[in-house]
């Protein structure tokens, strides 16, 4: 057995509509059938959960209806999208992967993706 490695991009720039997407890839040491993916935001020493989803291998991952995250899975790769971001949400977003079943449990934590969010300039009033 060996520890699980998780890879994610170092930097992502959110779109002008406040949407950021990145890939979280894990090197699975075992044959997991149930995987939990969590996105955590680290600001200073505080870590807060942004969203989490558990999925069965081969199935789609589904976040809660009120989640700001959506995602798709393909093998050992998860494509994550975070919506509704504003400039104040700029920060380090960490991908945490847990192989929940069958035992043994494995933990993998990425180094984090720095997401930069720039609020769009308000449109100037037109004189027409």
């Amino acid at each position: 057995c060996k520890a699980m490695h998780v890879a994610q991009p170092a930097v992502v720039l959110a779109s002008s509509r406040g949407i950021a997407s990145f890939v979280c890839e894990y090197a699975s040491p075992g044959k997991a059938t149930e995987v939990r993916v969590t996105v955590l935001r680290q600001a200073d020493s505080q870590v807060t959960e942004v969203c989490a989803a558990t999925y069965m291998m081969g199935n789609e991952l589904t976040f809660l209806d009120d989640s700001i995250c959506t995602g798709t899975s393909s093998g050992n790769q998860v494509n994550l999208t975070i919506q509704g971001l504003r400039a104040m949400d700029t920060g380090l977003y960490i991908c945490k992967v847990e192989l929940m079943y069958p035992p043994p449990y494995y933990l993998g934590i990425g180094n984090g993706t720095q997401i930069y969010v720039i609020d769009p300039e308000p449109c100037p009033d037109s004189d027409f």
Epitope: C1, K2, A3, T38, A52, L107
Partner: antibody, heavy 119, light 106 residues
Framework: QVQLVESGGGVVQPGRSLRLSCTAS????????MHWVRQAPGKGLEWVAV????????HYGDSVKGRFTISSDNSKNTLYLQMNSLRAEDTAVYYC????????????WGQGTLVTVSS | EIVLTQSPGTLSLSPGERATLSCRTS?????LAWYQQKPGQAPRLLIY???SRATGIPDRFSGSGSGTDFTLTISRLEPEDFAVYYC?????????FGGGTKVEIK
């Protein structure tokens, strides 16, 4: 603030059962993995079991597998450890502990409850 | 299961001295934590992720290492630092602890 309070320890005969409880406050119980860790008198720490998040997954240490059952009631913010077929070597202080968001290291611990298995 | 080996078993030092505690894991991992335990008390988290200090831990405590060899260093021992220290791996279940190192007053 986060608090964990264990109860249910005591003296029990070999082969008998006991149920430990751990009441949590100050955080959302279902967002964390919750663990039991024990320490035999004068010995080191031994991880016993974990229940994950919504309670659908549980993992156990080899020495208690098949005898101990971990469970939780999220509505009561309470963690349980049902201990069956107790042996003398199960004598220990049992701690409940919260696994942190970034992994199963334990940022908060209860004060512990002593279980003595003796005839 | 992953085996953690701590050394030395006991460290006899004087206040103000530097303490260096070792933890070796049987499998390479960065998911390593350190705890301090005093008699009659629950353990207290010091370090996680091999080198990150937990909230409220004085900066005289530092963790280092990677792969299979890890170190907890107490730069200048204070009277309240004399205790037993445990390392723990949390990357793969079952989560395991080292046997502990007792830091005692010389």
């Amino acid at each position: 603030q986060v608090q964990l309070v264990e109860s249910g320890g005591g003296v029990v005969q070999p082969g008998r059962s006991l149920r430990l409880s751990c009441t949590a406050s100050g955080f959302t119980f279902s967002n964390y993995g919750m663990h039991w860790v024990r320490q035999a008198p004068g010995k080191g720490l031994e991880w016993v079991a974990v229940i994950w998040y919504d309670g659908s997954n549980k993992h156990y240490g080899d020495s208690v597998k098949g005898r101990f059952t971990i469970s939780s009631d999220n509505s009561k913010n309470t963690l349980y450890l049902q201990m069956n077929s107790l042996r003398a070597e199960d004598t220990a202080v049992y701690y409940c502990a919260r696994g942190e968001r970034l992994g199963s290291y334990f940022d908060y611990w209860g004060q512990g409850t002593l279980v003595t298995v003796s005839s | 299961e992953i085996v953690l080996t701590q050394s030395p078993g006991t460290l006899s030092l004087s206040p103000g001295e530097r303490a260096t505690l070792s933890c070796r894991t049987s499998v390479s991992s960065s998911y390593l934590a350190w705890y301090q335990q005093k008699p009659g008390q629950a353990p207290r988290l010091l370090i996680y992720g091999a080198s990150s200090r937990a909230t409220g831990i004085p900066d005289r405590f530092s963790g280092s290492g990677s792969g299979t060899d890890f170190t907890l260093t107490i730069s200048r021992l204070e009277p309240e630092d004399f205790a037993v220290y445990y390392c723990q791996q949390y990357g793969i279940s079952p989560f395991t602890f080292g046997g502990g190192t007792k830091v005692e007053i010389k």
